[in-house]
């Protein structure tokens, strides 16, 4: 028998520095977690102790903090090289700055193979990107070789900016021939490493003949065997065992997100490459693990540029940006409109001639808007200003919801109106009218939504049975502020870009902004 240790990360999302327990900015260092310096300590400890070790990343290193905003992926290549990753799969967020924003900072600089079998380049891009990412890689480990096949969510064109010269194929269809090639090369230990979410990971384990292990990402799935060490609730045991269609037991793993855990899986193979046993658990990277001093010093060196960036002007406002709780928790506020407009603008994807865009709606809990921005400071808006408005380090995500769920959400928005509670929704691409004289749960009297399958966007009444795409904060997608109906009834959820980054990019693009209060949210006569 031959034993392999797979160390894995996924959805690190720019958390190069240690973070608080909830993966936001580290405040009390003695209770902080993760970060590349701490990760390196643990990886090196395992490499020294065990003979056959692979360090793999399942995508979405890009996007999530000011590190990515400033360094645009150069930080990912630099620190992943320093940690000596063995391979990485492309995630959807790796395309957030377009193909060039992937090629130059990461693909050309990474000293490890970057993989995806279901992304096919065409046109002029094909020769430019040739060899910079691969469908699979055979890695030598000890006296054996291990095949790694990559995959990426086929939804990427709707979630990011891969352009028109990359085709995202069905994962299973694309993976099978690559696995077959590996078998033809007499490679009999094969890991599928990719970024399509836990449900697809399980399908790959079930359907792709020859895959021995699946290491996934995208859904931020936390798996654990035994008592979990922090706040995350396990979605299943680690590893999660799937019985393949040809009767094999295939371990599937993921390691939550944000570099909080290091996935640790030990696999035993027989001489024919069959998995005999698999066991392990994610390792919580808490403060009991010291940060590696040399990596930490490097982090501190790179940090300097971030501090300078946060005070630079992004753009100007010529109006007061009202982000006060007195406004945003009670009525339409122009800060809410600005943020929602930025959220929609960040998700413009012309992927189908029938649709002007794939999504037109935004909802945003008023309680998530934490500060106004005064225009009387020469109109200057900085990252620092935006960090005061959006201090939680969240993301603006894409969900699919039925009209009926949206209706419930808007009822919840005003179910206890008047108490300055955070669930009052700011909107974009939606016209809502409330009648507060009616009883809670029956206060939405009009709900019109902007069409997407149209050449001239207009507002149509919400249809209860129709499925709509909506951009919203991850906080709401996870049921925050009492929006349990969104969490329970959402049909799809893809995590998006860092909230501040979305707004800062929009302001930089617009240069001068002047959001108005324009009647997106109304109260029917006599009730307000």
């Amino acid at each position: 028998a031959w034993e392999l240790t797979i160390l894995h990360t996924n959805d690190v999302h720019s958390r190069l520095e240690q973070t608080s327990e909830d993966s936001s900015k580290c405040v009390n260092a003695s209770r902080c977690m993760g970060g590349v310096a701490r990760l390196f300590t643990k990886v090196q400890q395992i490499r020294r102790a065990e003979p056959n070790v692979l360090l793999l990343d399942a995508g979405d290193q890009y996007q999530g903090t000011i590190w990515f905003t400033v360094y645009k992926g150069a930080e990912v290549a630099h620190f992943m090289n320093a940690l000596r990753y063995d391979a990485m799969a492309l995630g959807n967020h790796e395309f957030d700055n377009g193909v060039e924003g992937l090629i130059e900072p990461l693909l050309k600089e990474a000293k490890f193979p970057i993989l995806s079998a279901n992304i096919k380049a065409k046109g002029p891009l094909a020769s430019q990107i040739s060899g910079l990412y691969l469908p699979y890689k055979v890695l030598p480990v000890g006296d054996e070789v291990v095949g790694i096949v990559g995959y990426t969510s086929k939804e990427t064109p709707f979630l990011s900016n891969p352009g028109t010269n990359l085709v995202f194929e069905d994962e299973i269809t694309a993976l099978q021939p690559e696995v077959d090639k590996l078998k033809t090369l007499n490679v009999n230990k094969i890991i599928a490493l990719g970024h399509s979410g836990f449900e697809m990971d399980k399908l790959i384990a079930q359907k792709v003949r020859g895959v021995d292990v699946v290491v996934g990402g995208h859904s931020n799935t936390f798996l654990y065997t035994g008592n979990p060490p922090s706040k995350e609730v396990p979605a299943g045991k680690y590893p999660f065992i799937v019985t393949s269609d040809d009767g094999r037991k295939v371990p599937v793993v993921q390691a939550y997100a944000f570099g909080k855990y290091l996935g640790y899986l030990k696999i035993e193979f027989d001489e024919r490459g069959n998995v005999i046993s698999s066991h392990g658990n994610p390792i919580l990277l808490n403060s009991s693990i010291p940060e590696d001093p040399s990596i930490k010093a490097d982090i501190n060196k790179w940090r300097i540029k971030l501090d300078n960036y946060s005070t630079q002007e992004l753009g100007k406002t010529i109006v007061y940006l009202d982000g006060s709780s007195q406004s945003c928790r009670f009525r339409e506020c122009n800060m809410g409109n600005l943020i929602c407009d930025a959220m929609i603008n960040n998700n413009l994807r012309h992927t189908d001639e029938m649709f002007w865009n794939h999504v037109s709606m935004c909802i945003l809990n008023g309680g998530g808007i934490r500060s106004p921005i005064d225009e009387r400071n020469n109109g200057t808006i900085t990252w620092e200003n935006l960090a005061a408005v959006l201090p939680f380090g969240g993301t603006f995500d894409l969900v699919q919801l039925k009209g009926s769920t949206l209706k419930k959400a808007f009822e919840h928005s005003v179910h206890r109106y008047g108490q300055s509670t955070g669930e009052f929704l700011q909107v974009g691409g939606i016209h809502v009218v409330y009648d507060l004289s009616r009883k809670p749960g029956d206060r939405v009297v009009k709900l019109d939504v902007l069409c997407t399958k149209c050449r001239v966007p207009s507002y149509d009444p919400l249809k209860m049975d129709e499925v709509y795409k909506v951009i919203l904060p991850n906080f709401l997608a996870n049921g925050g502020d009492g929006f349990q109906m969104i969490k329970d009834e959402l049909l799809r959820h893809d995590s998006g870009d860092q909230d501040i980054n979305v707004v800062s990019t929009y302001i930089s693009k617009m240069k001068v902004i002047y959001p108005a209060v324009e009647g997106r949210i109304k109260f029917s006569t006599g009730s307000h």
Epitope: K108, K111, F112, P113, G131, L139, P140, K181, T184
Partner: antibody, heavy 118, light 107 residues
Framework: QVQLQQSGPELVKPGASVRISCKTS????????IYWVKQRPGQGLEWIGW????????KYNEKFKGKSTLTADKSSSTAFMQLSSLTSEDSAVYFC???????????WGQGTLVTVSS | DIVMTQSHKFMSTSIGDRVSITCKAS??????VAWYQQKPGQSPKLLIY???TRHTGVPDRFTGNTSGTEHTLTISSVQAEDLALYYC?????????FGSGTTLEIK
């Protein structure tokens, strides 16, 4: 473009050692295997072994174990092969080559002629 | 070790002819066969891998085929620049092994 530049010809005495270099450019050195191949005058090709610079893994053809030692220097993107206890049987042209994605030899150095003679 | 046998040390052909060079593996190597061309004083040059996948820049007159353990490189219309030494290689398992070579010459 991908290039592998080998060191010049060597004339060495029996029993001595020789170190051949293979300097690469035009690609990320750590991401591809470097293979070494022997070709005796008027004869076929023999695979000596590989080094994978990414993790410095080395695999030898059993026939060349003890004869060749493969190393790599990531900082200069250069692979090396040392041949020891040389005999006339080791007189040959030695090639370094790079894979496309494992196991076939897509790009070759120009070859280094080693002549073992007293 | 897998032995790759190229039974023809020399093959004579004329410009414009179709010619096939064969190579027999001592055991099943599936489609994991590559072909190389070597001219005097030069390094070998990869033509084909995976039995029939042409390497970048290789003219489409070069094709490969497999039938059981018999592997074939075919040149559909021989050009003057094709006169060279051809090696097969199995990339199925280590140690990777080559055939002894077939020299293509003018009749």
């Amino acid at each position: 473009q991908v290039q592998l530049q080998q060191s010049g010809p060597e004339l060495v005495k029996p029993g001595a050692s020789v170190r051949i270099s293979c300097k690469t450019s035009g690609y990320t050195f750590t991401n591809y295997y470097i293979y070494w191949v022997k070709q005796r005058p008027g004869q076929g090709l023999e695979w000596i072994g590989w080094i994978y610079p990414g993790n410095l893994n080395i695999k030898y053809n059993e026939k060349f174990k003890g004869k060749s030692t493969l190393t790599a220097d990531k900082s200069s993107s250069t692979a090396f092969m040392q041949l020891s206890s040389l005999t006339s049987e080791d007189s040959a042209v030695y090639f370094c080559a790079r894979d496309d994605n494992y196991a076939w030899f897509a790009y070759w150095g120009q070859g280094t002629l080693v002549t073992v003679s007293s | 070790d897998i032995v790759m046998t190229q039974s023809h040390k020399f093959m004579s052909t004329s410009i414009g002819d179709r010619v096939s060079i064969t190579c027999k593996a001592s055991q099943d190597v599936s489609t994991a066969v590559a072909w190389y061309q070597q001219k005097p004083g030069q390094s070998p040059k990869l033509l084909i891998y995976w039995t029939n996948t042409r390497h970048t820049g290789v003219p489409d007159r070069f094709t490969g085929n497999t039938s059981g353990t018999e592997h074939t490189l075919t040149i559909s219309s021989v050009q003057a620049e094709d006169l060279a030494l051809y090696y097969c290689q199995q990339h199925y398992s280590t140690p990777f092994t080559f055939g002894s070579g077939t020299t293509l010459e003018i009749k």
